[in-house]
């Protein structure tokens, strides 16, 4: 990608925390070794990253979680990549599915996600989970972030 | 990217090579259907991707192994994704984690690994795994690499 | 990426489609959240992305499957990413495996493969699957796709 | 109920400067984009600037950039927009409006540039 | 930037009768699976109204008489049976590309 003012990188890699909220949205931090190339993509309110600049990115996510089936509902662990633009706009982009491992107290297991997708100005993406107290924030195991094509 | 002499395109993916050497950190070789781009990346003793040029890169790594959970100890499977930057400690950059299958005599399963980080020139990127034993070394199934944005 | 005439951004993105075909190769098409940057990637019969201009590519699959050990093969569900360039074999350039789940009816896992390739002017890229019967074509789960570095 | 009020019209000299406000009332201020739309006496609608929610990305119509600035401050639920070098084409009622699809507006404001 | 053109710059209908306004823009306003379509409605002396978003979805308290179709370059207001306080001036607005766009306005009359 251009480095020039026109064409900056733009980039973000930001990583799990751990929260006490009950909600299913992700939450995330600029801590340890994460990435945040400049302010054309930002991490707001720790759950979404927001982009200034309309066009191709390439988003991903990596959500490692430890179940276990007698403990968990029927339904497998779900990750899903979604899209929030201004305007009504909230759509899944990504979805990954894993049934819960028969391991005891509870097997981990890793799900990645990746694409390219257009976002447009002001256009947010976050990380939805079927269960967040699953999700396990050790070092590297749970990371989320994007690059601008 | 530019194609110039001042942004010349960096890339590489290599393939998983088995070992008899005991340590945790997978081997790779430019063979089969490898990416070396040019010499501003390198493979280095067949175990690290070490870049000459600071900037952001998405570095990746798919692993794939057979495992079974009375064969193998409680913990899981464990690949890592890690830095060595010249005069610093090596840090783990991703994480992901998979429970052994009950499958006989093995059950394989594959994990998938990738984000963006900033490199420093002389920075090395390398996979460590639980137990290099039970990786797949089948066409395809394990594999490294990074690009440049 | 430029967005100059010389060095057009090329990605695309690509939804699973089911398919009556026995075939082991997944069907694809460019609805819901797809991408198409331009004419010189294409989707060629709902199977494989084709692309007009040589370069590297970073290219992507992501399939989900719901699976059952004993209604199975003990062989795993294994998919791969393969290359078909004008004039020469296919070649498998990427390969993930897992077991089958003890769920019942079935259990889904998901899979995700990625790396960096050199393809050739008119080279085409396609995913095959053990048990295409198996993939799970809801919103999100199984895609496809690549991005010219 | 969604309310929104501007304020800081008025009469202005061409090169001058004006601070329009929006205060906002019924609904989480933060969680949404606002818009400046404009609409000069007898004529159609045109938009002027938005400005995303918590960072504070901010877009401008060709017509205003670089003289006008649009900010918001989420704990007072207001916006604004300061407008400097002030031109007789920008003559004009200002409305707010809530999110990219304009689903609520202000009443408007009118900013008058002569001489 | 992308134009937006709509058509008639006015239309007299009797009431009861369908008015039907048209709006063009000069590439199109699809992102993925929507059209980044809305329609106002201004009476004189007050601020516009959002009538339909996303070309179809009719807003919440507007009566549904009012309908949005097309996809692409080419979008339809349409006013099934016109009342008296349906008399103004409806816009179509594009937000697919910065800068947001508005068409240039077509005045409803009745016949």
């Known amino acids: 990608m251009q480095k020039g003012d026109q064409n900056p990188q733009i980039a973000a890699h930001v990583i799990s925390e751990a929260s006490s909220k009950t909600t299913s949205v992700l939450q995330w931090a600029e801590k340890g070794y994460y990435t945040m190339s400049n302010n054309l993509v930002t991490l707001e309110n720790g759950k979404q990253l927001t982009v200034k600049r309309q066009g191709l990115y390439y988003i991903y996510a990596q959500v490692t979680f430890c179940s276990n089936r007698e403990a968990s509902s029927q339904a497998p662990f779900i990750a899903s990549l979604c899209l929030k633009s201004p305007g009504r706009f909230e759509r899944i982009l990504l979805r990954a599915a894993n049934t819960h491992s028969s391991a005891k107290p509870c097997g981990q297991q890793s799900i990645h996600l990746g694409g390219v997708f257009e976002l447009q100005p002001g256009a947010s993406v976050f990380v939805n989970v079927t269960d967040p107290s699953q999700v396990s924030h050790g070092t590297g195991f749970t990371s989320f972030g994007l690059l601008k094509l | 990217m530019q194609k110039g002499d001042q942004n010349p395109q960096i890339a590489a993916h290599v393939i998983s090579e088995a070992s008899s050497k005991t340590t945790s950190v997978l081997q790779w070789a430019e063979k089969g259907y490898y990416t070396m781009s040019n010499n501003l990346v390198t493979l280095e003793n067949g175990k690290q991707l070490t870049v000459k040029r600071q900037g952001l890169y998405y570095i990746y790594a798919q692993v794939t192994f057979c495992s079974n959970r009375e064969a193998s100890s409680q913990a899981p499977f464990i690949a890592s994704l890690c830095l060595k930057s010249p005069g610093r400690f090596e840090r783990i950059l991703l994480r992901a984690a998979n429970t052994h299958s009950s499958a006989k005599p093995c059950g394989q399963q594959s994990i998938h690994l990738g984000g963006v980080f900033e490199l420093q020139p002389g920075a090395s990127v390398f996979v460590n795994v639980t137990d290099p034993s039970q990786v797949s070394h089948g066409t395809g199934f394990t594999s490294f690499g990074l690009l440049k944005l | 990426m430029q967005k100059g005439d010389q060095n057009p951004q090329i990605a695309a993105h690509v939804i699973s489609e089911a398919s009556s075909k026995t075939t082991s190769v997944l069907q694809w098409a460019e609805k819901g959240y797809y991408t198409m940057s331009n004419n010189l990637v294409t989707l060629e019969n709902g199977k494989q992305l084709t692309v007009k201009r040589q370069g590297l590519y970073y290219i992507y699959a992501q399939v989900t499957f719901c699976s059952n050990r004993e209604a199975s093969s003990q062989a795993p569900f294994i998919a791969s990413l393969c290359l078909k360039s004008p004039g020469r074999f296919e070649r498998i350039l990427l390969r993930a495996a897992n077991t089958h789940s003890s769920a019942k009816p079935c259990g889904q896992q998901s899979i995700h493969l990625g790396g960096v390739f050199e393809l050739q002017p008119g080279a085409s890229v396609f995913v095959n699957v053990t048990d295409p019967s198996q993939v799970s074509h809801g919103t999100g789960f199984t895609s496809f796709g690549l991005l010219k570095l | 109920e969604v309310q929104l009020v501007e304020s800081g019209g008025g009469l202005v000299k061409p090169g001058g400067s004006l601070r329009l406000s929006c205060a906002a009332s019924?609904?989480?201020?933060?969680?949404?984009?606002m818009s400046w739309v404009r609409q000069a006496p007898g004529k159609g609608l045109e938009w002027v600037s938005e400005?995303?929610?918590?960072?504070?990305?901010?877009y401008y119509s060709d017509a205003v950039a670089g003289r006008f600035t649009i900010s918001r401050d989420n704990a007072k639920n207001s916006l604004y927009l300061q407008m400097n070098s002030l031109r007789a084409e920008d003559t004009a009622v200002y409305y707010c409006?809530?999110?990219?699809?304009?689903?609520?507006w202000g009443q408007g404001t009118l900013v008058t540039v002569s001489s | 930037d992308i134009v937006m053109t709509q058509s008639p710059d006015s239309l007299a209908v009797s009431l009861g009768e369908r008015a039907t306004i048209n709006c063009r823009a000069s590439?199109?306003?699809?992102?993925?699976?929507?059209?980044?379509m809305q329609w106002y409605q201004q009476k004189p002396g007050q601020p516009p109204k959002l009538l339909i978003y996303?070309?179809?979805n009719l807003e919440s308290g507007v009566p549904d008489r009012f309908s949005g179709s097309g996809s692409g370059t080419d979008f339809t207001l349409t006013i099934s049976s016109l009342q008296a306080e349906d008399v103004a001036v409806y816009y179509c607005?594009?937000?697919?590309?910065?800068?947001?766009?508005f068409g240039q306005g077509t005045k409803v009359e009745i016949k």
């Open positions: 409006a809530r999110d990219r699809v304009l689903d609520y």
């Open positions: 019924g609904f989480t201020f933060s969680d949404y984009a």
């Open positions: 400005i995303s929610t918590v960072h504070t990305y901010t």
């Open positions: 590439e199109s306003v699809e992102y993925y699976d929507t059209s980044l």
């Open positions: 996303a070309a179809s």
């Open positions: 607005q594009q937000t697919k590309k910065l800068p947001w766009t």
